[in-house]
C-alpha cells in the first residue's frame, strides 16, 4: 500500500525531515507550510492549524526572511529630492536610490520616481539642478506643456544646475517664468556647459 499523504500540519516520523516548502515548527513540533517568497506568516501554525500566509501590504517588502517565510515586512525606501530610483523594490528587496546625474532631477520623495531630464528651454531663467527642473523664461503664458505647469511672476530660487549658476542673457521679452510641476517619471538627460 502506498504511504498516506500527510497534510500540514503533521508530526514527522522520528529521524525524518519535513518536505519541500515545509518547515519544522519548534513550538508546535509539527511540519508546517512555508510561506512563498514575498509572503509572511500572519499566523504561525499550531498542532491543529497550518500557517496562515499573507503578502506584505503595497509599498512594503519582506525585510527579514526566515525558513517559515517572511518574519518582517518593512516600508519601501523613499528616494528624497535629488535622488531617483535606481532599482525598484520587489516583494523581497528594497528600493535602491541613486543621485540624479547632471542634467537630470527628481523633486519628489518617492519609492517609484526616477530621475528625469531637465526640460529644454529657449531661454533659461533658472538652471536646473539635481532636485529641481530648469525654469524657462516664457514668452507664451498660455503654454500647455505639462499638467500642473505654474507661471511665476519672478524666479523662486537661484539654486543652480551643476555648472551654470546664472540665468541666460536674453533679448526675448520676459513676461513670466514657467515652473513645471508635472508628472515625475524616467531619466537620462542633458549636460551643462
Amino acid at each position: 500500500l502506498p504511504a498516506q499523504v500527510a497534510f500540514t500540519p503533521y508530526a514527522p516520523e522520528p529521524g525524518s525531515t519535513c518536505r519541500l516548502r515545509e518547515y519544522y515548527d519548534q513550538t508546535a513540533q509539527m511540519c508546517c507550510s512555508k510561506c512563498s517568497p514575498g509572503q509572511h506568516a500572519k499566523v504561525f501554525c499550531t498542532k491543529t492549524s497550518d500557517t496562515v500566509c499573507d503578502t506584505c501590504r503595497p509599498g512594503w517588502y519582506c525585510a527579514l526572511s526566515k525558513q517559515e517565510g517572511c518574519r518582517l515586512c518593512a516600508p519601501l525606501r523613499k528616494c528624497r529630492p535629488g535622488f531617483g530610483v535606481a532599482r525598484p523594490g520587489t516583494e523581497t528587496s528594497d528600493v535602491v536610490c541613486k543621485p540624479c546625474a547632471p542634467g537630470t532631477f527628481s523633486n519628489t520623495t518617492s519609492s517609484t520616481d526616477i530621475c528625469r531630464p531637465h526640460q529644454i528651454c529657449n531661454v533659461v531663467a533658472i538652471p536646473g539642478n539635481a532636485s529641481m527642473d530648469a525654469v524657462c523664461t516664457s514668452t507664451s503664458p498660455t503654454r500647455s506643456m505639462a499638467p500642473g505647469a505654474v507661471h511665476l511672476p519672478q524666479p523662486v530660487s537661484t539654486r543652480s544646475q551643476h555648472t551654470q549658476p546664472t540665468p541666460e542673457p536674453s533679448t526675448a521679452p520676459s513676461t513670466s517664468f514657467l515652473l513645471p510641476m508635472g508628472p515625475s517619471p524616467p531619466a537620462e538627460g542633458s549636460t551643462g556647459d
Partner: antibody
C-alpha cells in the same frame, strides 16, 4: 524671412570626426533653443541634440552622448555640431532646426540638411 | 522601434479625407505634452504642419487639422490633393528623454 543653412557634411571614416555648422538669419538667434535632428537614408526622424538660447545648457540623445558636442556662437548667429568617434549608424542627413516660440519641443523652421556618410 | 507609433502607410483618392494616427504612452502624449506634426515632401526637409495639437502655422491650409485625446493624437487631411503625397511625422516631449520623440512616419499616397 527665417533661414537656416547647414554645411560641413561629407564622407568620413569610422572613428573620424566632422564639424557641422548652421548659419541662421531672420530671427533673434539668442532667444531660441536650437536643435540638430537627423534622418538616416530611408528612415524616420531622430532628435540628436539641443542647446538653449544663451548656450548655458546642452541636451543630447543617449545615442550620441559623449561623442557629439553642440555649441553656438550668438555673435555669429551660428550653430555647431562637433561629431567625434563617428560610427556607420551616424550616417544620415543632419538638419538644424529652430525651437518654437514659447515651446522649444517643436521645430518651426528647418534647414535643408547636410549629408554625413560614415564609411570605410 | 519609435516611441510614438504611426501606421507606416495611408492612402486616399483626391478629394477624400484621410486620418493618420499617432499613439504614445503615459510618459509622452498621456502626460499632457503637446503633439506636433511635420510634413516631409519627397527629397525635401521636414516642415512644421501642426503645432500644439491643433494649431496651424501661417501658410498651412485649413484642410490640415490635428487633435489629441488621452495617449493618442491624429492628423486629418480633408479634400486630399496630389501635392499632399508625403511622409508625415508626429512628435512630442517625453518625460524619460532629453528631447522630443518622433513617430516612425506615415507615407501618404494619393491614388489616381
Amino acid at each position: 524671412e527665417v533661414q537656416l543653412l547647414e554645411s560641413g557634411g561629407g564622407l568620413v571614416q569610422p572613428g573620424g570626426s566632422l564639424r557641422l555648422s548652421c548659419a541662421a538669419s531672420g530671427f533673434t538667434f539668442s532667444s531660441y533653443a536650437m536643435h540638430w535632428v537627423r534622418q538616416a537614408p530611408g528612415k524616420g526622424l531622430e532628435w540628436v541634440s539641443a542647446i538653449s538660447g544663451g548656450a548655458t545648457t546642452t541636451y543630447y540623445a543617449d545615442s550620441v552622448k559623449g561623442r557629439f558636442t553642440i555649441s553656438r556662437d550668438n555673435s555669429k548667429n551660428t550653430l555647431y555640431l562637433q561629431m567625434n568617434s563617428l560610427r556607420a549608424e551616424d550616417t544620415a542627413v543632419y538638419y538644424c532646426a529652430k525651437g518654437g516660440t514659447g515651446d522649444p519641443y517643436y521645430f518651426d523652421y528647418w534647414g535643408q540638411g547636410t549629408l554625413v556618410t560614415v564609411s570605410s | 522601434q519609435s516611441v510614438l507609433t504611426q501606421p507606416p502607410s495611408a492612402s486616399g483618392t483626391p478629394g477624400q479625407r484621410v486620418t493618420i494616427s499617432c499613439t504614445g504612452s503615459s510618459s509622452n502624449i498621456g502626460a499632457g505634452y503637446d503633439v506636433h506634426w511635420y510634413q516631409q515632401l519627397p527629397g525635401t526637409a521636414p516642415k512644421l504642419l501642426i503645432y500644439r495639437n491643433n494649431q496651424r502655422p501661417s501658410g498651412v491650409p485649413d484642410r490640415f487639422s490635428g487633435s489629441k485625446s488621452g495617449t493618442s493624437a491624429s492628423l486629418a487631411i480633408s479634400g486630399l490633393r496630389s501635392e499632399d503625397e508625403a511622409d508625415y511625422y508626429c512628435a512630442a516631449r517625453d518625460d524619460g528623454l532629453s528631447g522630443p520623440v518622433f513617430g516612425g512616419g506615415t507615407k501618404l499616397t494619393v491614388l489616381g
